[in-house]
């Protein structure tokens, strides 16, 4: 069938359109194009005779049409009036006619639109704004863009006038955005330049910064005010209601207590005509003096004197604080604070109370610290120590003893031998000693400030013969596989060899045995029950030797896995069941029994007379050692058969 296709269907003014013929019949005589939907000689555009290839213009010919041999019609420089239907009339050789109609529409090329507004400076929460997209164009679609996004859904946004007008009701500062409109028709689309909506708002309640309201006398006061506003706000400052200046910042150098008061910032928007104020109360405090500490006793005696430290000066309505060793005061019954905290009393001072001590005066802004004070606590002398610790010396050696006692001020020392004063020195030296130098050596330490004296007496024996040694231990009851034990051979003697024996034998080679301190100390690591032996130490020099009494190590161990005897597990009915439980343990373990999980008696032996098959079950012996903290158990199954039913059964006890 003969059809007409318009390419394109929608044609822009000034462009061209091709009316393309499809299914043109064979053996044609000619054809003609008409404007409209029917053949009308008055509206003929052009005719064409195939035999002569002659095109003849018709009444509707405009000079812009070109006809092609295939019957297609090209129309150039399209005008709005070209819109409509076009009919092709085909005359075949047999003079039979055929018609086909096509159409196209003509649209103008759209101009670039622009936005007009009914209110260039709307006021927030008060005004509405109507944007209109210009020009008004027939057959055009209108679209709107906000910040290059399509319109948000909002009850305050309304489109009207065929979407050509966008109205914003009750504008807010958030409506300040880039607005564009767009016009579209089938042949073109154009977007306007952006229009920025300038919403007048504010001022909001101003904020004053910094937030600090407390100042010290002598500081600078620098306040800044800010309020959200369009156009920017104009600022004024008032102090205690009196106008100061029209600036955003208020600066007052070197303030005094007199500058305390209410500071008001007023923000004004000349376009909206609105004013907002914020008030802050500024307090200026007088600078307190630096505190200092006085003491009622600059040289207190340990365990005798009390010391009262007072924080000066005395100021009414002031909080006093104290620190010791840069820490807040510890809780101690020896530390007492007065009701106003101004006086700190140390009852019965000790040498550890030297400090330093600091007091502080707290005002509303900060704490002022005093300089630290250190107490000169007089103490001692403590019991003097005489070194070296040797008590036995061989004849012919030099005896050099030194004495020391903790004391403040440092102690004065004196030496006495057998009660007779020798010399007032810290060290005593006697060369080439003999047996006659044996005796009681006393060191006396004296504290001249406190008047206290302390003495220590040491027995010095000068002899070629060594004394009988003894063994001291750091752990009298070590736990197996856990503890170590250190035996020390006493006394410590000069130029002496120390020896050890275990069960009368010399020490075995073992990584668990270690000698130290010149062989004077024997350490047993990870003791075992086999270490529970007799230990003897010996001392010897070139002229004598001596041995200690034996010390037996009491090793706590166990309980090991218990053993239930007799081993029998099958019994005849009527026999007595007599089970004994044993576990290696030191101290002896605590024994208890359970039958089928039910606790029985707390004994080592379990006795049941005349058992029956009801006594079948599991018999568990539990052992515990409270010293090692360990427990153990064993379970034995007992079967009781009726008399004579099974051979080889135990008759029981």
């Amino acid at each position: 069938k003969l059809t007409i296709e318009s390419t394109p269907f929608n044609v822009a003014e000034g462009k061209e359109v091709l009316l393309l013929v499809h299914n043109l019949p064979q053996h044609l005589f000619g054809y003609s194009w008409y404007k409209g939907e029917r053949v009308d000689g008055n509206r003929q555009i052009i005719g064409y005779v195939i035999g002569t290839q002659q095109a003849t213009p018709g009444p509707a010919y405009s000079g812009r049409e070109i006809i092609y041999p295939n019957a297609s019609l090209l129309i150039q420089n399209i005008i709005q009036n070209d819109t409509g239907f076009y009919t092709l009339h085909v005359i075949k050789s047999d003079l039979v006619n055929e018609e086909a109609t096509g159409q196209f529409r003509v649209y103008p090329e759209l101009p670039k639109p622009s936005i007009s507004s009914n209110n260039s400076k709307p006021v927030e929460d008060k005004d509405a704004v109507a944007f209109t997209c210009e020009p008004e164009t027939q057959d055009a679609t209108y679209l709107w863009w906000v910040n290059n996004q399509s319109l948000p859904v909002s009850p305050r946004l309304q489109l009207s006038n065929g979407n050509r007008t966008l109205t914003l009701f009750n504008v807010t500062r958030n409506d300040t955005a880039s607005y564009k409109c767009e016009t579209q028709n089938p042949v073109s689309a154009r977007r306007s330049d952006s229009v920025i909506l300038n919403v007048l708002y504010g001022p909001d309640a101003p904020t004053i910064s910094p937030l600090n309201t407390s100042y010290r006398s002598g500081e600078n006061l620098n306040l800044s005010c800010h309020a959200a506003s369009n156009p920017p706000a104009q600022y004024s400052w008032f102090v205690n209601g009196t106008f100061q200046q029209s600036t955003q910042e208020l600066f007052i150098p070197n303030i005094t207590v007199n500058n305390s008061g209410s500071y008001t910032c007023q923000a004004h928007n000349s376009d909206t005509g609105l004013n907002r104020t914020t008030v802050t109360t500024i307090t200026v405090y007088a600078e307190p003096p630096k505190p200092f500490i006085t003491s009622n006793n600059s040289n207190p005696v340990e365990d005798e004197d009390a010391v009262a430290l007072t924080c000066e000066p005395e100021i009414q309505n002031t909080t006093y604080l104290w620190w010791v060793n840069n820490q807040s005061l510890p809780v101690s019954p020896r530390l007492q604070l007065s009701n106003d905290n101004r006086t700190l009393t140390l009852l019965s001072v000790t040498r550890n109370d030297v400090g330093p001590y600091e007091c502080g005066i707290q005002n509303e802004l900060s704490v002022d610290h005093s300089d630290p004070v250190i107490l000169n606590v007089l103490y001692g002398p403590d019991d003097p120590t005489i070194s070296p610790s040797y008590t036995y010396y061989r004849p012919g050696v030099n005896l050099s003893l030194s004495c020391h006692a903790a004391s403040n001020p440092p102690a004065q020392y004196s030496w006495l031998i057998d009660g007779n004063i020798q010399q007032h020195t810290q060290e005593l030296f006697i060369s080439n000693i003999t047996e006659k130098n044996s005796g009681l050596y006393t060191c006396q330490a004296n504290n001249s400030a406190s008047g206290h004296s302390r003495t220590t007496v040491k027995t010095i024996t000068v002899s070629a013969e060594l004394p009988k040694p003894s063994i001291s231990s750091n752990n009298s009851k070590p736990v197996e596989d856990k503890d170590a034990v250190a035996f020390t051979c006493e006394p410590e003697a000069q130029n002496t060899t120390y020896l050890w024996w275990v069960n009368g034998q010399s020490l075995p080679v073992s990584p668990r045995l270690q000698l130290s301190n010149g062989n004077r100390t024997l350490t047993l690591f990870n003791v075992t029950r086999n270490d529970a032996r007799a230990y003897v130490c010996g001392i010897q020099n070139s002229v004598s030797a001596n041995r200690s009494d034996p010390v037996t190590l009491d090793v706590l161990y166990g309980p090991d896995t218990p053993i239930i005897s007799p081993p029998d597990s099958s019994y005849l009915s009527g026999a007595n069941l007599n089970l004994s439980c044993h576990s290696a343990s030191n101290p002896s373990p605590q024994y208890s029994w359970r039958i089928n999980g039910i606790p029985q008696q707390h004994t080592q032996v379990l006795f049941i007379a005349k058992i029956t098959p009801n006594n079948n079950g599991t018999y568990a012996c539990f052992v515990s050692n409270l010293a090692t903290g360990r427990n153990n158990s064993i379970v034995k199954s007992i079967t009781v058969s009726a008399s004579g039913t099974s051979p080889g059964l135990s008759a029981g006890a």
């Epitope: 009298s476 002896s588 605590q590 208890s592 707390h602 004994t603 080592q604 409270l626």
Partner: antibody, heavy 120, light 107 residues
């Protein structure tokens, strides 16, 4: 009902001898380690001697060692205390007790006691 | 020998009160400690063993605590039947020794 009943307490002269008995009933006597404990007139409690369940192990404090002997007859469910060379400080109520756990256990059960007075 | 030091020697209290008796061992006895109650004219009765285990039938107002060398027996909400003498005793092997006792009397 578990019972321990002591007997044999009398007045005896210093240097004299005495044998106390304790009859057990209501429990498996042969299973329990036993001890004698005495209470002096000043109400002080003193442990006197210990014997294990089988009778093979005994312990004595130094105050009675060599003078007192503990024994038991499991067939008769009876515990004994043979005392000799008695002294006035041996005057006390003598209690028969049964142990929990063996030699590392407390005195779980006590008899009503029998009074021994040593006086000239 | 291990010495047991018990305190106080005597104590007066009222029904409903809480009292504590203490016992100190001269050396480490771990948890091998028992407490006994003795009423006038009666035999002692075992209350607590292994320092804190209550004997069957002993009311829960009694409680024992401690280990090593320091021990205590606490009686909450004293009842009339609780008055009498209390003794501690170590059972850390022989020789067993007792404390000197605490007499608890009605105020």
């Amino acid at each position: 009902e578990l019972q321990l009943v002591e007997s044999g307490g009398v007045l005896v002269k210093p240097g004299g001898s005495l044998k106390l008995s304790c009859a057990a009933s209501g429990f498996a006597f042969s299973s329990y380690d036993m001890s004698w404990v005495r209470q002096t007139p000043e109400k002080r409690l003193e442990w006197v001697t210990y014997i294990n369940s089988g009778g093979g192990i005994t312990y004595y404090p130094d105050t009675v060692k060599g003078r007192f002997t503990i024994s038991r007859d499991n067939a008769r469910n009876t515990l004994y205390l043979q005392m000799s060379s008695l002294k006035s400080e041996d005057t006390a109520i003598y209690y028969c007790t049964a142990h929990y756990f063996g030699s590392s256990g407390p005195f779980a059960y006590w008899g009503q006691g029998t009074l021994v007075t040593v006086s000239a | 020998d291990i010495q047991m030091t018990q305190s106080p020697a005597s104590l007066s209290a009222s029904v409903g009160e809480t009292v504590t008796i203490t016992c100190r061992a001269s050396e480490n006895i771990y948890s091998y400690l028992a407490w006994y109650q003795q009423k006038q004219g009666k035999s002692p009765q075992l209350l607590v063993y292994n320092a804190k285990t209550l004997t069957e039938g002993v009311p829960s107002r009694f409680s024992g605590s401690g280990s090593g060398t320091q021990f205590s027996l606490k009686i909450n909400s004293l009842q009339p039947e609780d008055f009498g003498s209390y003794y501690c005793q170590h059972h850390y092997g022989t020789p067993f020794t007792f404390g000197s006792g605490t007499k608890l009397e009605i105020k």
